[in-house]
C-alpha cells in the first residue's frame, strides 16, 4: 500500500437546509482507471463511514440510491455534498480516497473538514 | 433490470448513412459511460466507440474515425451511433454495451448490411 | 490482426480444466485492466471476468483470471457442455485511446 496526499478544506458551514459541499482533492500518482471515495465522520474519538463511492474511468461518481452524500468527479477532485444533517452531526468528515486499478494501490486519507451544522430557529407564530 | 435495446439496423447501400439508437432502462443512463461494439458476420468483436456519461470525452477505433460520431441524450436515456460514409466491412451486428472498459451489459444488437 | 492475441481454438473433455491465453503490450494488458467475455451461439457477449481476475455476481467459481506482465489468461475447471462457446479478452489500449479486443476463441467440449 502507498500512500498518497488528500486535500480538503478546513472548515465549512453546513446551509439552513442541513446540506454541506465540499471538494476533496488527490494526488494522483498515475492515471488510476477505478477509484474508490470514502467519507468517514469522526467524533468523540469515534470514527464512522457516512458514505462510500467506487467510479470507472468515464463514469460519473454513484453513491447508493439511500445515501445522504451525492458527488462529481472531475479529473483528480471528487465535490462532495451531504444532505440530511443537523446540528448533532457536527464534526470532523475525512475524505480517504484509494486508488483501486491499476496496481500498485494507493491509499490517501485528508485531514478532515470539520463541519458545522446549526439547526435553524423554528418560525415564531404569527398572527394576522 | 438492466436492458440496452438497439434499433436502427438495415440495409443500406454504400457510401451512404444510417442512424443507430440504443434505448437503456434498469439504471441511471447518465452516471454511465456508454459504447458501441459491432462483430462482422463470423468474425469476432471489434470495438466502435465510447461516450462518457456527460459526453465530455468520446474515443473512436481508427477504422471508423471521421465518419461515425457518437452522442447521447441523457434526457431520453438514449444512446446514438450516426454512421456516415459506409462501406462493405462495416457490415456488422452493432451492439451498445455499458461503460468504457468493462462492459457488464450489452444489448442483443442491430444487424447493419452494406451492400449494392 | 487484433491488437491482442488469443489461440482460434481449445478443446477439452467434461470435467477437465483448459487454459485460455490472451498476449498483449505495455499499452494494453500491461498497464489497464483486462476483461473477459463468454459468447454463446446465437447471443451477445456476457461478462465474465473483470479487472483481470474478478467475477461478476452470477458467474461460478468454475471461472477464473489471471494476469502476468502483458498476458492474462482464462481458466475454466470443471469443464461443461454448455461452456462451448466463443471467449474473448479485452483490454483498454492506452496509445490507441480506445479499447482492444482478442480475435476470440472457440471453446469445443468433447
Known amino acids: 500500500c502507498k500512500a498518497m496526499h488528500v486535500a480538503q478544506p478546513a472548515v465549512v458551514l453546513a446551509s439552513s437546509r442541513g446540506i454541506a459541499s465540499f471538494v476533496c482533492e488527490y494526488a494522483s500518482p498515475g492515471k488510476a482507471t477505478e477509484v474508490r471515495v470514502t467519507v468517514l465522520r469522526q467524533a468523540d474519538s469515534q470514527v464512522t463511514e457516512v458514505c462510500a463511492a467506487t467510479y470507472m474511468m468515464g463514469n460519473e461518481l454513484t453513491f447508493l440510491d439511500d445515501s445522504i452524500c451525492t458527488g462529481t468527479s472531475s479529473g483528480n477532485q471528487v465535490n462532495l455534498t451531504i444532505q440530511g444533517l443537523r446540528a448533532m452531526d457536527t464534526g470532523l468528515y475525512i475524505c480517504k480516497v484509494e486508488l483501486m486499478y491499476p496496481p500498485p494501490y494507493y491509499l490517501g486519507i485528508g485531514n478532515g473538514t470539520q463541519i458545522y451544522v446549526i439547526d435553524p430557529e423554528p418560525c415564531p407564530d404569527s398572527d394576522f | 433490470e438492466v436492458q440496452l435495446l438497439e434499433s436502427g439496423g438495415g440495409l443500406v447501400q454504400p457510401g451512404g448513412s444510417l442512424r443507430l439508437s440504443c434505448a437503456a432502462s434498469g439504471f441511471t443512463f447518465s452516471n454511465y459511460a456508454m459504447s458501441w461494439v459491432r462483430q462482422a458476420p463470423g468474425k469476432g468483436l471489434e470495438w466502435v466507440s465510447v461516450i462518457y456519461y456527460d459526453g465530455s470525452n468520446k474515443y473512436y477505433a481508427d477504422s471508423v474515425k471521421g465518419r461515425f460520431t457518437i452522442s447521447r441524450d441523457n434526457s431520453k436515456n438514449t444512446l446514438y451511433l450516426q454512421m456516415n460514409s459506409l462501406r462493405a466491412e462495416d457490415t456488422a451486428v452493432y451492439y451498445c454495451?455499458?461503460?468504457?472498459?468493462?462492459?457488464?451489459?450489452w444489448g442483443q444488437g442491430t444487424l447493419v448490411t452494406v451492400s449494392s | 490482426q487484433s491488437v491482442l492475441t488469443q489461440p482460434p481454438s481449445a478443446s477439452g473433455t467434461p470435467g477437465q480444466r483448459v487454459t485460455i491465453s490472451c498476449s498483449g503490450s505495455s499499452s494494453n494488458i500491461g498497464n489497464n485492466a483486462v476483461t473477459w467475455y463468454q459468447q454463446l451461439p446465437g447471443t451477445a457477449p456476457k461478462l465474465l471476468i473483470y479487472s483481470d481476475s474478478n467475477r461478476p455476481s452470477g458467474v461460478p467459481d468454475r471461472f477464473s483470471g489471471s494476469k502476468s506482465g502483458t498476458s492474462a489468461s482464462l481458466a475454466i475447471s470443471g469443464l461443461r457442455s454448455e461452456d462451448e462457446a466463443d471467449y474473448y479478452c479485452?483490454?483498454?489500449?492506452?496509445?490507441?485511446?480506445?479499447?482492444?479486443f482478442g480475435g476470440g476463441t472457440k471453446l469445443t467440449v468433447l
Open positions: 454495451a455499458r461503460n468504457t472498459y468493462r462492459f457488464d451489459y
Open positions: 479485452g483490454s483498454w489500449d492506452s496509445s490507441l485511446s480506445g479499447y482492444v
